[in-house]
């Protein structure tokens, strides 16, 4: 059965999908669709790549990773409850019945309602500007940028994003990839 992924309303959702190109730049067409993968295609396509580039996308759907290296994980921006459901990642490997298809279940949870603190605190000094997550090779760094006032809700959101990023890297490290060639 499909693997389940979760995100909160208003956050970005991450659906992992990877393959290993036979050679650098030797890309395979990939499509992402809303709905379970049909027999040949991708369902209601939200994003598509060809041998060179992303050649079709719709608003809020994008590839955040390096798709030229086979990271075709889908990011859905600012999700709503309507984004819940099954998504299809199809790696259209040339040849006879070589396609790899993956059904991923996205569950959207309502946003946590965090009571506002009685006095706004300045977490700038206490909260680091850089968050480092485990990845391949050099440390992957997420930069928060200039955030003069980070409230509790923002910290919760950042922590969730960090957790999701770690999950993504764990998936990548676990070898959940398709090798081609």
């Amino acid at each position: 059965s499909e693997v389940e992924y979760r995100a909160e309303v208003g956050q970005n959702a991450y659906l992992p999908c990877f393959y290993t190109p036979a050679a650098p730049g030797n890309l395979v067409p990939v499509c992402w669709g809303k709905g379970a993968c049909p027999v040949f295609e991708c369902g209601n396509v939200v994003l598509r790549t060809d041998e060179r580039d992303v050649n079709y996308w719709t608003s809020r759907y994008w590839l955040n990773g390096d798709f030229r290296k086979g990271d075709v994980s889908l990011t859905i921006e600012n999700v709503t409850l309507a984004d819940s459901g099954i998504y299809c990642c199809r790696i259209q490997i040339p040849g006879i019945m070589n396609d790899e298809k993956f059904n991923l279940k996205l569950v959207i949870k309502p946003a946590k309602v965090t009571p506002a603190p009685t006095r706004q605190r300045d977490f700038t000094a206490a909260f680091p500007r850089m968050l480092t997550t485990r990845g391949h090779g050099p440390a992957e760094t997420q930069t928060l940028g200039s955030l003069p006032d980070i409230n509790l809700t923002q910290i919760s959101t950042l922590a969730n994003e960090l957790r999701d990023s770690r999950l993504a890297n764990d998936l990548r490290d676990s070898g959940a990839t398709i090798r081609i060639g």
């Epitope: 395979v28 067409p29 990939v30 499509c31 669709g33 709905g35 379970a36 049909p38 027999v39 040949f40 295609e41 991708c42 369902g43 209601n44 396509v45 099954i86 199809r90 259209q92 490997i93 040339p94 040849g95 006879i96 019945m97 070589n98 396609d99 059904n103």
Partner: antibody
Framework: EVQLVESGGGLVQPGGSLRLSCAAS????????MSWVRQAPGKGLEWVAA???????YYPDSVKGRFTISRDNAKNTLYLQMNSLRAEDTAVYYC?????????????WGQGTLVTVSS | EIVLTQSPATLSVSPGERATLSCRAS??????????MQWYQQKPGQAPRLLIY???NVESGIPARFSGSGSGTEFTLTISSLQSEDFAVYYC?????????FGGGTKVEIK
């Protein structure tokens, strides 16, 4: 208006080869999975081959290794190369467009081209 | 491969009457809550025409007298009131697995 026009059929001897073509118009050809479906005289329908929008190929065991489906998106044309033909390959061959986003069923069909394999 | 068995092979019906055609699959064609079964109509000398997709969805331009039902392995095409132009051969087809397969057909003839 969506149109699919097959050509290339004819009489061929057992063991021979033939290439069928299907000229497509009226839609964005590259976005659709395409199939060939055949019908032997007085018989039912048999799916013969499919090619996805991404170029993946699919065949039933009855033609695997003998038939090759291909497409030229620049020319909006679908092909079926048929080798090592047998008497049982005699049929009307239809080019069919797979429904967008799915591909596994067919919303437009050509008029068909007759292939006769006989000595 | 999924084998589709249609019955009856021939159905004799008078114009204006109701026709019920059956298609049985050798295994379930359910997929994430959708039945991946289609129905086509074919008249002599013509290409097939899509009538019903996903078991019960009527294709655009198809008269409302055509309807489809069923799930799992048992499917039905119903023509509520046969018109003269409906006398033809009808095929079911599954799109769950390769190879795609068709039923053997039901010929609807004038009684």
């Amino acid at each position: 208006e969506v149109q699919l026009v097959e050509s290339g059929g004819g009489l061929v001897q057992p063991g021979g080869s033939l290439r069928l073509s299907c000229a497509a118009s009226g839609f964005t050809f590259s976005r659709y999975a395409m199939s060939w479906v055949r019908q032997a005289p007085g018989k039912g329908l048999e799916w013969v081959a499919a090619i996805s929008s991404g170029g993946s190929l699919y065949y039933p065991d009855s033609v695997k290794g003998r038939f090759t489906i291909s497409r030229d998106n620049a020319k909006n044309t679908l092909y079926l190369q048929m080798n090592s033909l047998r008497a049982e390959d005699t049929a009307v061959y239809y080019c069919a467009r797979g429904r967008e986003a799915d591909g596994g069923y067919f919303d437009y069909w050509g008029q068909g081209t007759l292939v006769t394999v006989s000595s | 491969e999924i084998v589709l068995t249609q019955s009856p092979a021939t159905l004799s019906v008078s114009p204006g009457e109701r026709a019920t055609l059956s298609c049985r699959a050798s295994e379930s064609v359910e997929y994430y809550g959708t039945s991946l079964m289609q129905w086509y109509q074919q008249k002599p000398g013509q290409a097939p025409r899509l009538l019903i997709y996903a078991a019960s969805n009527v294709e655009s331009g198809i008269p409302a007298r055509f309807s489809g039902s069923g799930s799992g392995t048992e499917f039905t095409l119903t023509i509520s009131s046969l018109q003269s132009e409906d006398f033809a051969v009808y095929y079911c087809q599954q799109s769950l697995k390769v190879p795609l397969t068709f039923g053997g057909g039901t010929k609807v003839e004038i009684k």
